[in-house]
């Protein structure tokens, strides 16, 4: 029941479930200079009856010996080839995490955990794409892949999406040299915009390193 | 076809808030924003901020930095708007509507919300 | 911010004309442009997304142009079904900005 595939890489593009469905594994990873404690579970575990679900297991890390703070923990070898990164949320999100029926929803932070986290997702499960900031969709609507079952095999359902990053550089007020607008990098954002999270500090980055926009560690 | 249906108009005393919501029928937020974007009346439109429900990245304008707060509740498909020290200047018609693809908030909006009357007065 | 400048403010047509509406960004905005419909009482309706992208279930005689700081919405063949006040929407840079609105009334 296991996907064995990751959801499909999508150029300039992030995903992430709205739920976890029940079966779902979260691999208790640490961040740099901490590990596992040693009688600490492996991975969280999405489980539940019809009107409730919930996480079973609790991921802890403990700071590593000063020989190893650099090694970072790592998956067992039965566990690698599901490796599904998403994003960390914020511990500011602002969504409700009323449950959904036979779905976890993100599981909160435990204490320096890593930076990114590692589903292993089942069958049945639906992921959602957005285009990074600065990148634009060539598509109109929503972007999903969901995990199926066919002949035996699992398989994702590739997204209709394509992020563009056509760049639009022009001289912005005040500024003595030009920048790139926000299909390729946010222009006004520090002066005119306020978001909660991350995301655009990311995209600063994201010109340039076309690095993921949630892959940063909780402030 | 997803709907969004807003609440009831508001009449509020200033100083104080109001909270609209927005609620998608029809089918789910996926990854799509909702803005919110509000009218005075006889003026034109103007944007106040959006929101990503699934991946929680909220955006303001910094008009409204600090007075304003959106949020989603993806289990019940519902995006709120919270306007907080309200005053007389803030009677207008507010609308949620929502991005046209998964480009963050900064979207053009296909499907808007009825719109809901706020009204600030003493 | 980016100013949107629609013009003219308020214009006047018959039915069966051909309408052309112009909408100024003070900076250069690509193709990332909206146009909408309002009704009075209503909400804004999305015509033209992406400069020149007619929004599925607008009828074809709603054709947009342009890129860059330049752009219009022509009617092709006014219908009485479009009497309304028009908004050009960039989406380029933060924070999104409308234009003041174009009326067209029944000469």
């Known amino acids: 029941e296991l996907c064995d595939d990751d959801p499909p890489e999508i150029p300039h593009a992030t995903f992430k479930a709205m739920a976890y469905k029940e079966g779902t594994m979260l691999n208790c990873e640490c961040k740099r200079g901490f590990r596992r404690i040693k009688s600490g579970s492996l991975y969280m575990l999405c489980t539940g009856n019809s009107s409730h679900s919930s996480w079973d297991n609790q991921c802890q890390c403990t700071s590593s010996a000063t020989r190893n703070t650099t090694k970072q923990v790592t998956p067992q070898p039965e566990e690698q080839k599901e490796r599904k990164t998403t994003e960390m949320q914020s511990p500011m999100q602002p969504v409700d995490q009323a449950s959904l029926p036979g779905h976890c929803r993100e599981p909160p932070p435990w204490e320096n955990e890593a930076t990114e986290r590692i589903y292993h997702f089942v069958v049945g499960q639906m992921v959602y794409y957005q285009c990074v900031q600065g990148y634009r969709a060539l598509h109109r609507g929503p972007a999903e892949s969901v995990c199926k079952m066919t002949h035996g095999k699992t398989r994702w359902t590739q997204p209709q999406l394509i992020c563009t990053g056509e760049m639009e550089t022009s001289q912005f007020p005040g500024e003595e040299k030009p920048q790139a607008s926000p299909e390729g990098r946010p222009e006004s954002e520090t002066s005119c915009l306020v978001t909660t999270t991350d995301f655009q500090i990311q995209t600063e980055m994201a010109a340039t390193m076309e690095t993921s926009i949630f892959t940063t560690e909780y402030q | 076809q997803v709907q969004l249906v807003q609440s009831g108009a508001e009449v509020k005393k200033p100083g104080s808030s109001v909270k609209v919501s927005c609620k998608a029928s029809g089918g789910t937020f996926s990854s799509l924003a909702i803005t919110w974007v509000r009218q005075a009346p006889g003026q034109g439109l103007e944007w106040m901020g959006g929101?990503?429900?699934?991946?929680?990245?909220?955006s303001y304008a910094q008009k409204f930095q600090g007075r304003v707060t959106i949020t989603a509740d993806e289990s019940t498909s519902t995006a709120y708007m919270e306007l907080s020290s309200l005053r007389s200047e803030d009677t207008a018609v507010y609308y949620c509507a929502r991005g046209g693809s998964v480009s963050g908030t900064l979207v053009d909006f296909d499907i808007w919300g009825q719109g809901t009357m706020v009204t600030v007065s003493s | 911010d980016i100013q949107m400048t629609q013009s003219p403010s308020t214009l006047s047509a018959s039915v069966g004309d051909r309408v052309t509406i112009t909408c100024r960004a003070s900076q250069s905005i690509s193709s990332w442009l909206a146009w909408y419909q309002q009704k009075p009482g209503k909400a804004p309706k999305l015509l033209i997304y992406k400069a020149s992208s007619l929004e599925s279930g607008v009828p074809s005689r709603f054709s947009g142009s342009g890129s860059g700081t330049e752009f219009t919405l022509t009617i092709s063949s006014l219908q009485p079904d479009d009497f309304a006040t028009y908004y050009c929407q960039q989406y380029n840079i933060y924070p999104i900005t409308f234009g003041g609105g174009t009326k067209v009334e029944i000469k």
């Open positions: 929101i990503i429900p699934i991946f929680g990245d909220a």
